[in-house]
């Protein structure tokens, strides 16, 4: 049996996909099925993540890298490495403790996730509302009234239901 040995840490010769036991002469062991080591010289193999229930497998586990999960349709990932799945809502809604609720007047959500945000207050930038906002879309601000040619009318901006001045993220 042939192996290359390191003069420093003998475990450094154990590649990814194996683990190392300092207490043994034969130091490298392959990771058992459904476990992995992503770097050389590791003392243990980690159990592969299993994508179950509302999670689905985006990338299969291998002996050198963990499985990666995403969420089944109707849900989206939250947290580092998709640690949680949260229910989708429709555009124009936000998720509350009681489920999906329509955005209040003066707020919008153009995604299936996240919270409803206030419409942009065009007047804070000295502009006028060109297109009114909806539950699904922010207002579209146009030129300031002073920029409008004589005779042109400006649309009165709607009064926001929440604190004004927040731009969409």
């Amino acid at each position: 049996f042939e192996r290359t040995r390191s003069l420093q840490d003998p475990c450094s010769n154990c590649p990814a996909g194996t683990f190392c036991d300092n207490n043994r002469n034969q130091i490298c062991s392959p990771c058992p099925p459904n476990s992995f080591s992503s770097a050389g010289g590791q003392r243990t193999c980690d159990i592969c993540r299993q994508c179950k229930g509302v999670f689905r497998t985006r990338k299969e586990c291998s002996s050198t890298s963990n499985a990666e999960c995403d969420c089944t349709p109707g849900f989206h990932c939250l947290g580092a490495g998709c640690s949680m799945c949260e229910q989708d809502c429709k555009q124009g809604q936000e998720l509350t403790k009681k489920g999906c609720k329509d955005c209040c007047f003066g707020t919008f959500n153009d995604q299936k996730r996240g919270i409803c945000r206030p419409w942009t207050n065009c007047s804070l930038d000295g502009k006028s509302v060109l297109v009114n906002g909806t539950k699904e879309r922010d207002v579209v601000c146009g030129p300031s009234p002073a920029d409008l040619s004589p005779g042109a009318s400006s649309v009165t901006p709607p009064a926001p239901a929440r604190e004004p001045g927040h731009s969409p993220q």
């Epitope: 590649p15 990814a16 194996t18 034969q26 130091i27 058992p32 099925p33 291998s62 002996s63």
Partner: antibody
Framework: EVQLVESGGGLVKPGGSRKLSCAAS????????MHWVRQAPDKGLKWVAY????????YYADTVKGRFTISRDNAKNTLFLQMTSLRSEDTAMYYC???????WGQGTTLTVSS | NIVMTQSPKSMSMSVGERVTLSCKAS??????VSWYQQKPEKSPKLLIY???NRYTGVPDRFTGSGSATDFTLTISSVQAEDLADYHC?????????FGAGTKLELK
């Protein structure tokens, strides 16, 4: 679906050479170490060689050391076993397997005989 | 090298009987033992890994047990399709080694 398909077996004279291939599909080949394991007619399984996922670490059984060379081409999802100085006792079915040893190919038969 | 010794070499069973196959390691291999089923003219299939973990899709009539040097594969109620050779193998350290196999025949 994970698939491993060996090829390259056949009849070789003693002292001759042969190169076996193992084509992998259905999994991320470049993320798995790979083994060659052989089985002589009506005998048990014998491990032959191992190559790590990136090809930097290689182990051989004492019986083949210096005669066999394991290699891989991750771009082509293929594992190889170059065999030289073949002997009659190398006659066997040769299997490739992932390093989890959970999937095996269907095998390719090597016969070393004059 | 670690030597894996299987017993018996062969056994004849009737459908529905309980089967116990033995595998002994020449030194402590922890729980790093796998069991494989090999049907005639086919490649080995993984049944059990880590001494007692049933692999995906393996019927629950197959059970592995043991640690250190003594390991057992039990088939609780043998079926006609279980006619095969059964191999144990250790992955505790390189070189990987396997037993000579146990041939399961039906009466």
């Amino acid at each position: 679906e994970v698939q491993l398909v060996e090829s390259g077996g056949g009849l070789v004279k003693p002292g001759g050479s042969r190169k076996l291939s193992c084509a992998a599909s259905g999994f991320t080949f470049s993320e798995f170490g790979m083994h060659w394991v052989r089985q002589a007619p009506d005998k048990g399984l014998k491990w032959v060689a191992y190559i790590s996922s990136g090809g930097s670490t290689i182990y051989y059984a004492d019986t083949v050391k210096g005669r066999f060379t394991i290699s891989r081409d991750n771009a082509k999802n293929t594992l190889f076993l170059q065999m030289t100085s073949l002997r009659s006792e190398d006659t066997a079915m040769y299997y490739c397997a992932r390093d989890w040893v959970d999937y095996w190919g269907q095998g390719t038969t090597l016969t070393v005989s004059s | 090298n670690i030597v894996m010794t299987q017993s018996p070499k062969s056994m004849s069973m009737s459908v529905g009987e309980r089967v116990t196959l033995s595998c002994k390691a020449s030194e402590n291999v922890g729980s790093y033992v796998s069991w494989y089923q090999q049907k005639p003219e086919k490649s080995p299939k993984l049944l059990i890994y880590g001494a007692s973990n049933r692999y995906t899709g393996v019927p629950d009539r197959f059970t592995g047990s043991g640690s250190a040097t003594d390991f057992t594969l039990t088939i609780s109620s043998v079926q006609a399709e279980d006619l095969a050779d059964y191999h144990c193998g250790q992955s505790y350290s390189y070189p990987l080694t396997f037993g000579a196999g146990t041939k399961l025949e039906l009466k």
